[in-house]
């Protein structure tokens, strides 16, 4: 509950406000209750963090967040007698971290990371303006199913790009999702200042490309089933089929947000398949479909990344140009 | 075969604004930085801003901050120099160069003039 | 800024001799230097990065070597096509910056 009753007098500051880091970007927070409590006053602690972000009113005497240490980040902690957001708390005590020392200009940009198909991570940076062309680099990266940090050993460059990339496969745990990877890339010198990100695990996903199956014709209607990238359930998926007809030059894109196998002409009961009519097209011509997926936002934050085209297939005749 | 092509120089008063394109060819566009570089007769070969390869991070010299803006099109593989605030001493041929691995430029368009004169 | 100095600004040569061009830096650059050649009305051409390693397509008679604030651009033996201006540039630092230029000229 609310505790006993709330004195008027101003509680005394809590002591010993102390911060450390776990991992590679979990901050806490840890403190010691007021000296001189009120003894019929029980204990609340108001939080929050520089910004006046995130306020908070709780029992306990830690806090921790999860935030890229790119820069100086502080959590101010005052005691109370009650849950009350308009009770004065005591004096604000304030502790702060800073990122790890070094030249912001030699720090990597653009850290970021995509998750492949639910299989693998691949982060990619691009070397700060004030940084020695020759400078190695190491990621290392966290996971809450992982029992220590780990260092990223497939490193590669791509044009002015670095990156690297590790295996990160979906577990069974429901709440596996829920957590967000750890990032942080340094060089092996220990010259450039340190880069951080954080990368929940319903953003930034691509699916691998699906796999045409059939591909079949019912009056001038085509009928496209496919196969989803494993990993993913249809549902969770948005579609792009897209077909190209040779006479006429035809391109037609079909956004598809649903795409089930109900109807009669589709092979039925075959796992993980998806399903599409394209109306009005000539079977009496050669027509070539490919088809993209990405996730979709019942399942994921994010649904910005397509996959890449799945293998053409055709159907029909290529007429004889005369 | 790498290829640069620069364009959009011409005469303009001062205060006035004018904006450069560059379109490049022969190679992965995305992956890498693409700047502009001036020259002038009296104070030579001079760097004036740049854009990684996805545009998100931009650099400038000082000489032009605040009145320079770059961006970059990967669909169209161009990039465009917007300058505002023209003065007297922005009057320079401007290439537009592809970066190398790192800050040196391997790849040159042919040049723009831009001309600031009332 | 990074400052590099060049010398000398101008030289006159003839065809077949070595030319050698000195490149010196306002702090030790590593080995981050490029050289280019420039043509009249023409755009620079790359030649020579990390001090020493040749552009694709470069003649074998361009070499560099240095380190730190010495560098040196040889011609080992002068070609007809090769009378243009030479810069030098650090990229050690941002931002990256040029050699005032050498003139190289016909005896």
């Known amino acids: 509950g609310g505790g006993g009753a709330a004195p008027t007098e101003t509680q005394p500051p809590v002591t010993n406000l102390s911060v450390s880091v776990e991992n590679l970007c979990t901050v806490i927070w840890t403190w010691n209750p007021p000296e001189g409590a009120s003894s019929n006053c029980s204990l609340w602690y108001f939080s929050h963090f520089g910004d006046k972000q995130d306020k908070k009113i709780a029992p306990e005497t830690r806090r921790s967040i999860e935030v890229p240490l790119n820069e100086r980040i502080c959590l101010q902690v005052g005691s109370q007698c009650s849950t009350n957001e308009s009770e004065k708390p005591s004096i604000l005590v304030e502790k702060c971290i800073s990122p790890p020392e070094g030249d912001p200009e030699s720090a990597v940009t653009e850290l970021q990371c995509i998750w492949h198909n639910l299989s693998y991570m691949k982060c990619s940076w691009l070397p700060g303006r004030n940084t020695s062309p020759d400078t190695n680099y190491t990621l290392y990266y966290w996971h809450r199913s992982l029992e220590k940090i780990h260092q990223c050993e497939n490193i590669f460059r791509e044009g002015q790009y670095f990156g690297c990339s590790f295996d990160l496969t979906k577990v069974k745990d429901s709440s596996f999702e829920q957590h967000s990877v750890q990032i942080m890339v340094k060089d092996n010198a220990g010259k450039i200042k340190p880069s951080f990100n954080i990368v929940p695990l319903t953003s930034r996903v691509k699916p691998d490309p699906p796999h045409i199956k059939n591909l079949s014709f019912h009056n001038d209607d085509l009928y496209v089933q496919w196969e989803n990238p494993q990993n993913f359930i249809s549902r969770c998926l948005f579609y792009e089929v897209e077909v190209n007809n040779s006479q006429t030059e035809t391109h037609n894109v079909f956004y598809v947000q649903e795409a089930k196998c109900e109807n009669p002409e589709f092979e039925r009961n075959v796992e993980n398949t998806s399903c599409f009519m394209v109306p009005g097209v000539l079977p009496d011509t050669l027509n070539t479909v490919r088809i993209r997926v990405k996730t979709n936002k019942l399942c994921y934050e994010d649904d910005k990344l397509w996959s890449n085209w799945s293998q053409e297939m055709s159907i029909g005749k290529k007429r004889n140009s005369t | 075969e790498v290829q640069v092509l620069d364009s959009g120089g011409g005469l303009v008063q001062p205060g006035g604004s004018l904006r450069l394109s560059c379109t490049a060819s022969?190679?992965?566009?995305?992956?890498?930085?693409m700047s502009w570089v001036r020259q002038t007769p009296g104070r030579g070969l001079e760097w004036v801003s740049g854009?990684?390869?996805?545009?998100?991070?931009?650099y400038f010299a000082d000489s032009v901050k605040g009145r320079f803006t770059i961006s970059r099109d990967n669909s169209k593989n161009t990039v465009y120099l917007q300058m505002n605030s023209l003065r007297a001493e922005d009057t320079a041929v401007y290439y537009c160069?592809?970066?190398?691995?790192?800050?040196?430029?391997?790849?040159w368009g042919q040049g723009t003039l831009v001309i600031v004169s009332s | 800024d990074i400052q590099m100095t060049q010398s000398p600004s101008s030289l006159s040569a003839s065809v077949g001799d070595r030319v050698t061009i000195t490149c010196r830096a306002s702090q030790g650059i590593s080995s981050w230097l490029a050289w280019y050649q420039q043509k009249p009305e023409k755009a620079p051409k790359s030649l020579i990065y990390?001090?020493?390693s040749l552009q694709s397509g470069v003649p074998s008679r361009f070499s560099g070597s240095g380190s730190g604030t010495d560098f040196t651009l040889t011609i080992s033996s002068l070609q007809p096509e090769d009378f243009a201006t030479y810069y030098c540039q650090q990229y050690n630092s941002h931002p990256p910056t040029f050699g005032q230029g050498t003139k190289l000229e016909i005896k």
């Open positions: 854009i990684s390869g996805s545009g998100l991070s931009t």
């Open positions: 022969g190679f992965t566009f995305r992956l890498y930085t």
């Open positions: 160069a592809k970066e190398g691995d790192w800050i040196y430029f391997d790849s």
């Open positions: 990390a001090a020493s």
